[in-house]
Amino acid sequence: KSSNLEGRTKSVIRQTGSSAEITCDLAEGSTGYIHWYLHQEGKAPQRLLYYDSYTSSVVLESGISPGKYDTYGSTRKNLRMILRNLIENDSGVYYCATWDG
């Protein structure tokens, strides 16, 4: 089950070719793998990557170009992801998620 995350709905508008940053607020005890998803209208949610919160390693889903996304936690309660070289097809709702067990 999804857990340990505190949602904070935000809307971001950026020009194509620019970058955007998304923040995930983590509740106490969120450790292990944190996943980033993109949900676009009319499509199933797509996992983009997952992040090992201990070693700060990023594992991209196949087909995701290296350097498109980067994520890092400067505190244990906050995870940030940057999206680079934005195109129209990057539009959608981005989610972070983690699971117990």
Partner: antibody, heavy 116, light 107 residues
Framework: EVQLVESGGGLVQPGGSLRLSCAAS????????MNWVRQAPGKGLEWVSS????????YYADSVKGRFTISRDNSKNTLYLQMNSLRAEDTAVYYC?????????WGQGTLVTVSS | DIQMTQSPSSLSASVGDRVTITCQAS??????LNWYQQKPGKAPKLLIY???NLETGVPSRFSGSGSGTDFTLTISSLQPEDFATYFC?????????FGQGTKVDIK
């Protein structure tokens, strides 16, 4: 086997510059955040700088901010630390370390001595 | 920045002794505390992460406990290879900071 090998240390005069390198092997370097940690002779450990996997997020200790620059070349599996305006208090063994909230692999270190 | 204070700074013990090292944070860091072992001329080695989780390959005689501001590393039965310096590190926020170290030597 994960290996981190630092190089580039040596003796430099105050105000001088050095560039440290850390060659990584045995893991997917481009997926990991990396760090520099230093240890002055006979002293404790001091975190110096961190860089995220694609270099988007970079952090420095206040003691080196504006003088040191961390960077990485994922195509060469190498981490760098450019050190400018060196001071006597920068004398230390410099380690590169893999990880974020924990440092699970460390190099053997390279000694930087700042002295006239 | 979060300050980490270790005690004692050094201790003498014999093989087979139970050894306890403490680490205190200047503010609440939940359980985000790691312990490292360092032998002379070598790089530090991760022993315990998030206060009580044993790193893979680390002997079970090492254990960690604590939460908030007060933490403990315990070696249940000291072995010859355990004579080293031990450091705590908070991983609650950047900059991650280390304790000053505790040197464990032979009595």
């Amino acid at each position: 086997e994960v290996q981190l090998v630092e190089s580039g240390g040596g003796l430099v005069q105050p105000g001088g510059s050095l560039r440290l390198s850390c060659a990584a092997s045995g893991f997917t370097f481009s997926s990991y955040s990396m760090n520099w940690v230093r240890q002055a002779p006979g002293k404790g450990l001091e975190w110096v700088s961190s860089i995220s996997s694609s270099s988007s997020y970079i952090y420095y200790a206040d003691s080196v901010k504006g003088r040191f620059t961390i960077s990485r070349d994922n195509s060469k599996n190498t981490l760098y630390l450019q050190m400018n305006s060196l001071r006597a208090e920068d004398t230390a063994v410099y380690y590169c370390a893999r990880g974020g909230w924990l440092y699970d692999y460390w190099g053997q270190g390279t000694l930087v001595t700042v002295s006239s | 920045d979060i300050q980490m204070t270790q005690s004692p700074s050094s201790l003498s013990a014999s093989v087979g002794d139970r050894v306890t090292i403490t680490c205190q944070a200047s503010q609440d860091i939940s359980n985000y505390l790691n312990w490292y072992q360092q032998k002379p001329g070598k790089a530090p080695k991760l022993l315990i992460y998030d206060a009580s989780n044993l790193e893979t390959g680390v002997p079970s005689r090492f254990s960690g406990s604590g939460s908030g501001t007060d933490f403990t590393l315990t070696i249940s039965s000291l072995q010859p290879e355990d004579f080293a310096t031990y450091f705590c590190q908070q991983s609650y926020s950047t900059p991650q900071t280390f304790g000053q170290g505790t040197k464990v030597d032979i009595k």
